[in-house]
């Protein structure tokens, strides 16, 4: 099996990757500037950290995370290395242009590096549903039209509903799966006859993925407080995330076990269960009052994760060809909802305690932020299906899905490496 | 107790720099995030300027963008509002003002409420030719 | 971007009478975010109320804010001499900028 990329991907990867790089140079040289404002050096310092926090989940935790694949790990994790840097690359300019344009140019600050990285995650996160299927020619368009479409809609919902930068953000979940899913569903779906081994999980793949796991574990809290306003928040925001994270852990290979025959933990749930509890506070992680509160929620996140992992891959497979252990596209849709519910539940709380018809009016607003990201997810990625099966970007083969060796340079050139 | 202190403030030609300063006590200025307002003469207040407590994010009204930067020192609790190109209408006094976070909790949910709690005189800045 | 229209302009009234002044979003807003505050000439501009009713640390109790996200009134249920001022509200909610009301005029008849 060669392990060179066919030639019309070689001429066209490098040319387009490289163009494209050129032109968000020629873009940033020509419309940003840096914040040059004094500041103090420790604060900086300090908040440069959470930049760091989301770096390190983007790049270790969903890298890793995605390369359970048996020949596939090397691929996952510097696909999802390549997407994230050129994605807080555009998301930057875009951020920039849809908020600050009008006055001149745009101001880079640490905050914008936060939000970009944030919105190259939304990438990351939808990928795990294609990856494997599509090349590096193809991971740059769906880069482009995701970053651009959640770019979008956050300001839309900013000037319509007028929410802040959290809660337009915590709708990443949602979309980012909604995004990834109906991709997926565009794409060649049957694996034929003999390629079936390929998207089967190994051992030390499956320990990378567990180790990003891990990492996206220890690092949700920052996520989730990353773009609150106030310290008072973030910090009830970290409380709560980790609350909720420690809970879904013990309930996501408790859970795994009881739902297994004889007892035994499935890996593949382990993975993605143990984040439920971030996923399902997320949107109302600063609101949460109290730990017990955020620690049903996370049993409960645990709890469908783990569900979902049993009952769901198998139509997700059928439907959508998504792999069993590419979980994360329905185990985010399934929880991003409920987090979605969660916080639309206080607001009806708030509209039966106050007995405010205009409370009411905002769980409706809150419906209808949710319905916009959900469809405008949708949209956006059919519409990035339909590009992806150009024959212009040479997509891999069916039978060369989920191997590394289509895009690697091995000097051996072993089969079962 | 809480203490905002405006300085910088004078006149100045159009087109010109100037570069307000608030220093700040009686408090942890790093848990809170600040505000610019102002006031020209026979006018309402406009709000100028907020930057968050880790000066992370800043704002700034449409008026300004561009040609002021707000900034912070926390290790010198001090804000800053660097205004350049001055034009007549930025002619105002100069208010900055803490931003106080506030909350309550019912048994299922924290509100959390904003407001300008803590103000200083004030800083007069005139733009002339 | 929100405006917040402030009415009546100005009033006249005497001390000891009531007032309700209010304030409206050009569009829904979220209450937790409105603030009322009062200016006296030469002074710093003081918080009376936030999150729409909430009165701030000091306030007396015949200040009160009500409001839903369409149309927020502050009241001043017996005016002393020295609540003839200026009095702005502001909202600090969503995205920036954060705008203030035009301001309602309070004078001594």
């Known amino acids: 099996m060669s392990s060179k990329y066919p030639r019309s991907v070689r001429r066209c990867l490098p040319l387009w990757a490289l163009t494209l790089e050129a032109a968000l140079i020629l873009l940033f040289y020509f419309f940003t500037h840096y914040d040059a404002s004094l500041e103090d050096q420790k604060g900086l310092v300090a908040s440069y950290q959470v930049g760091q926090d989301l770096t390190v989940m983007a790049a270790i935790g969903l890298g890793f995370l995605t390369s359970s694949f048996r020949r596939h790990s090397w691929s996952s994790v510097a696909f999802n290395l390549f997407m994230l840097a050129l994605g807080v690359q555009w998301a930057i300019l875009l951020d920039g242009f849809l908020s600050q344009f009008p006055s001149g140019k745009v101001v880079i600050t640490l905050f914008s590096i936060r939000l970009a990285t944030m919105s190259a995650l939304s990438v990351l996160i939808s990928v795990d549903a294609v990856l494997g299927k599509v090349n590096l020619a193809q991971l740059v368009v769906m880069v482009l039209v995701e970053v651009t479409a959640l770019g979008n809609l956050r300001m839309v919902i900013s000037n319509i509903f007028n929410t802040d930068y959290h809660m337009n953000m915590m709708h990443i979940y949602v979309f980012a799966a909604y995004f990834g899913l109906s991709v997926a569903w565009c794409l060649p779906k049957p694996l034929p006859e003999g390629t079936e081994d390929k998207d089967q999980t190994a051992t030390i793949p499956s320990l990378s993925a567990m180790l990003g796991a891990l990492f996206l574990w220890m690092f949700w809290p920052s996520f989730n407080s990353a773009l609150l306003r106030s310290p008072i928040e973030r910090k009830n925001a970290v409380f709560n995330t980790y609350y909720a994270v420690a809970v879904s852990v013990v309930t996501a290979i408790s859970g795994s076990s009881l739902a297994h025959p004889q007892g035994k933990i499935s890996k593949t749930y382990v993975h993605s269960a143990v984040l439920a509890g971030g996923v399902a506070v997320g949107t109302s992680c600063h609101l949460i009052p109290s730990p017990w509160l955020a620690m049903v929620l996370g049993l409960v996140a645990g709890l469908i994760s783990v569900g979902g992992a049993k009952y769901l891959p198998g139509c997700c497979n059928r439907v959508l060809g998504i792999p069993h252990s590419s979980i994360m596209g329905y185990n985010f849709s399934l929880l991003g909802l409920l987090g979605e519910i969660i916080y639309i539940v206080l607001l009806v709380l708030d509209t039966v305690g106050a007995g405010n018809g205009m409370i009411g009016f905002q769980v409706l607003l809150s419906i209808g932020e949710l319905s916009l990201a959900i469809v405008i997810a949708l949209m956006s990625g059919l519409l990035t299906g339909l590009l992806l099966n150009l024959k212009i970007w040479k997509a891999p083969h069916e039978a060369k899905y989920f191997d590394d060796q289509v895009f690697w340079k091995f000097p051996h050139l072993a089969v079962g490496f | 107790q809480v203490q905002l202190v405006e300085s910088g403030g004078g006149v100045v030609q159009p087109g010109r720099s100037l570069r307000l300063s608030c220093a700040a006590s009686?408090?942890?200025?790093?848990?809170?995030?600040m505000h610019w307002v102002r006031q020209a003469p026979g006018k309402g207040l406009e709000w100028v300027a907020v930057i968050w407590y880790d000066g992370s994010n800043k704002y700034y009204a449409d008026s300004v963008k561009g040609r002021f930067t707000i900034s912070r020192d926390n290790s010198k609790n001090t804000l800053y509002l660097q205004m350049n190109t001055l034009r007549d209408d930025d002619t105002a006094v100069y208010y900055c003002?803490?931003?106080?976070?506030?909350?309550?909790?019912?048994?299922?949910?924290?509100?959390?409420?904003?407001?300008?709690?803590?103000w200083g005189q004030g800083t007069t800045v005139t733009v002339s030719s | 971007e929100i405006v917040l229209t402030q009415s009546p302009g100005t009033l006249s009234l005497s001390p000891g009478e009531r007032v309700t002044l209010s304030c409206r979003p050009s569009r829904y807003i979220a209450s937790d975010y409105l603030a009322w505050y009062q200016l006296r000439p030469g002074q710093a501009p003081k918080l009376l109320i936030y999150?729409?009713?909430s009165r701030a640390t000091g306030i007396p109790d015949r200040f009160s804010g009500v409001g839903s996200p369409t149309d927020f009134t502050l009241t001043i249920s017996r005016l002393e001499p020295e609540d003839f001022a200026m009095y702005y509200c502001?909202?600090?909610?969503?995205?920036?900028?954060?705008?203030f009301g035009q301001g309602t005029r309070l004078d001594i008849k």
């Open positions: 502001h909202y600090s909610g969503g995205s920036p900028p954060y705008p």
């Open positions: 003002a803490r931003e106080g976070t506030l909350y309550s909790s019912s048994w299922y949910r924290r509100y959390y409420y904003y407001g300008m709690d803590a």
């Open positions: 009686g408090f942890t200025f790093s848990s809170y995030g």
């Open positions: 999150g729409a009713s």
